[in-house]
């Protein structure tokens, strides 16, 4: 029999979401206007294409990547879209308030939409650790808190460390991973007897998850190059990201086979490891001077990803309650750190090459930036986790975890869906 969406949530969710949407519309009405200076329509189209790539990554890529659960694939895709739509709206306002507001109204440009989409992507990475254990009302809270935390982190880093848009945004990998893991840590963990099958992957949803991985794989160069200032930097970023993800695919598939006693390939490893190179190369994608270095980085990232997928799920399942197939959180946490370390190595090479005494200071600044991102992620993640545990959200009972029928109307109610 169909599990009805709890009555309290039926009252709470539409009211909460629509009130929030009305508030956002009012904020847009009073505080925003469009950039009126668009002289070059060709440039507008080219600029929009980058934003479109990011939206495809978010909506299709991350939407489908998280859809591999046997009985939670609909919710994964649709909830991701819901969070993306809400997150982009709030991120545009927040970025405007934090950076432009003293001058009057917030000017909305294609660039601000690009930044907002990337901020919302952070939530979609984080939510992988909690999807299936929370309802939409809780996800609204998660979107608001995470986008706010990331926006403030970016502003603080920009003001204190003077980093540019790209370096600023590339903390997203580490931030999103640690935010998601700390939220997951706060949520009820044990799966009651008889529901273990729900967090298993199934063939059709796994295929759609692979489709998501393919979309991310194709568009990752756009993500890594979106906030770079000049054509040559973007070209370098696109090339290096492409080489890195290409190598991480080969590494992921062969490494997955190597890690299995019978030499079989794990879908879960592949879903996430194909992206490994893109994450690891992110911070320094425009700085890597030759393809072979990007390829080596892709290889190392692929190996780390497969190794992590093999040995970390047990620990994450026990401690954080994260199912075996939701490995994006710890994957991105390791690979994001690898990317940051690569940048610090470049800084060291820089200062050693120049033969000046600034090496320690520059490295300390970079470590400080990274530490700040992790601390804010953990603190805001724990805050979110505590908020999500409040009774008012009517969280799904543990027995209803990973169950589409709690949220969706299925006319035929096929039990094996």
């Amino acid at each position: 029999m169909s599990s009805k969406y709890p009555r309290s949530v039926r009252r709470c969710l539409p009211l909460w979401a629509l009130t929030l949407e009305a508030a956002l519309i009012l904020l847009f009405y009073f505080f925003t206007h469009y950039d009126a200076s668009l002289e070059d329509q060709k440039g507008l189209v080219a600029s929009y294409q980058v934003g479109q790539d990011l939206t495809v990554m978010a909506a299709i890529g991350l939407g489908f990547l998280t859809s591999s659960f046997r009985r939670h694939s609909w919710s994964s895709v649709a909830f991701n879209l819901f969070m993306l739509a809400l997150g982009v709206q709030w991120a545009i306002l927040l970025d405007g308030f934090l950076s432009q507001f003293p001058s009057g109204k917030v000017v909305i440009t294609l660039f601000s939409i690009r930044l907002a989409t990337m901020s919302a992507l952070s939530v979609l990475i984080s939510v992988d650790a909690v999807l299936g254990k929370v309802n939409l009302a809780q996800l609204v809270v998660m979107v608001l808190v995470e986008v706010t935390a990331l926006g403030n982190l970016r502003m603080v880093i920009s003001n204190i460390f003077n980093t540019d848009y790209h370096m600023n945004m590339m903390h997203i990998y580490v931030f999103a991973a640690y935010f998601g893991l700390s939220v997951a840590w706060c949520l009820p963990k044990p799966l009651p007897e008889g529901t273990e099958d729900k967090d298993q992957t199934a063939t059709i949803p796994s295929l759609s998850a692979m489709l998501g991985a393919l979309f991310l794989w194709m568009f990752w160069p756009s993500f890594n190059s979106a906030l770079l200032r000049s054509p040559i930097e973007r070209k370098n970023a696109v090339f290096n990201t492409y080489y890195a993800v290409a190598v991480s695919v080969v590494t992921a598939i062969s490494g997955s086979s190597l890690a299995h006693p019978q030499g079989k390939i794990s879908k879960t490893y592949v879903h996430s490891a194909v992206l490994a190179g893109g994450v690891a190369v992110g911070t320094s994608c425009h700085l890597i001077p030759s393809p072979w270095l990007a390829m080596v980085l892709g290889l190392v990232a692929g190996l780390i990803s497969v190794g992590g997928a093999k040995y970390l799920p047990g620990c994450c399942n026990r401690v954080l309650g994260i199912p075996h197939s939701s490995i994006m959180g710890y994957n991105f946490s390791l690979l994001g750190l690898l990317g940051e370390i690569i940048y610090i190595v470049l800084l060291v090479l820089d200062t050693v090459g120049a033969g000046n005494g600034m090496i320690g200071f520059q490295v300390l600044l970079s470590i400080g930036e990274l530490s700040l991102a992790i601390v804010i992620a953990l603190m805001s993640g724990l805050l979110t986790g505590l908020l999500l545990n409040l009774k008012i959200w009517k969280a799904p009972h543990e027995a209803k975890y990973f169950d589409d029928q709690v949220f969706w109307k299925f006319p035929h109610l096929a039990v094996g869906f």
Epitope: G43, F111, N162, T163, R229, E233, Y343
Partner: antibody, heavy 127, light 106 residues
Framework: EVQLLEESGGGVAQPGRSLRLSCVAS????????MHWVRQAPGKGLEWVAD????????DYADSVKGRFTISRDNSKNTLYLQMNSLRAEDTAVYYC???????????????????WGQGTTVSVSS | AELTQSPSSLSASVADRVTITCRTS??????LNWYQQKPGKAPKLLIY???SLQSGVPSRFSGSGSGTDFTLTITSLQPEDFATYYC?????????FGPGTKVDLK
């Protein structure tokens, strides 16, 4: 081929009125470079005013002009613009456009330098 | 980052060695450029990234420094070098300029 920038549109304006400056590039394609406006008040130093990325996607402004000036570009016409609204006496200056040359000067980053400048156009704001 | 230059002006003779310093209010690594401006003319890029000489600029010009302290040195001043010199940081927007140092004939 000689790479040049040429500004136009300067003149005398009353406080509160508007002016639009143009900067035409020749000898190179504007679409490959970010661009800047820099001004110099009479007898004073250089002051950075605004910049725009190569594709027009992002713009930054000095606090003194934020909300009043708008930088834009038309790559198909190889032209950069500066729309100046609500002009004040302190906006009186020679306005230069400059090309943003991005150079890989370090292992850990790219640097901007202004390698080509226009000859400047004079804006005088007085009642 | 705010930039200060010293001296604000200096008088020198042809063939003199001239040193101009630029100090920033915060660490900018080596993201510093030097420009030369002659009266009624547009500025001209001399040095980028603190110490790299722009093509076409005579080798008597050199730059050094990192972090917060930078110097521009003209080893043997020539008649065409009498001008105003500006430092500029390009570490982050706004790309601020120093107040300038005027070099004139003693």
């Amino acid at each position: 081929e000689v790479q040049l920038l040429e500004e136009s549109g300067g003149g005398v304006a009353q406080p509160g009125r508007s002016l639009r400056l143009s900067c035409v590039a020749s000898g190179f394609s504007l679409r490959s470079y970010g661009m800047h406006w820099v001004r110099q008040a009479p007898g004073k130093g250089l002051e950075w005013v605004a910049d725009i990325w190569f594709d027009g996607s992002n713009k930054d402004y000095a606090d003194s002009v934020k909300g009043r000036f708008t930088i834009s570009r038309d790559n198909s016409k190889n032209t950069l613009y500066l729309q100046m609204n609500s002009l004040r006496a302190e906006d009186t200056a020679v306005y230069y456009c400059a090309r943003d040359w991005r150079v890989r000067a370090f292992s850990s980053g790219w640097l901007s330098a202004f390698d080509i400048w226009g000859q400047g156009t004079t804006v005088s704001v007085s009642s | 980052a705010e930039l200060t230059q010293s001296p604000s002006s200096l008088s020198a003779s042809v063939a003199d060695r001239v040193t101009i310093t630029c100090r920033t209010s915060r660490n900018i690594n080596r993201y510093l450029n030097w420009y030369q401006q002659k009266p009624g003319k547009a500025p001209k890029l001399l040095i980028y990234a603190a110490s790299s000489l722009q093509s076409g600029v005579p080798s008597r010009f050199s730059g050094s420094g990192s972090g917060t302290d930078f110097t521009l040195t003209i080893t043997s001043l020539q008649p065409e070098d009498f001008a105003t010199y500006y430092c500029q940081q390009s570490y982050s927007t706004p790309f601020t300029f120093g107040p300038g140092t005027k070099v004139d004939l003693k």
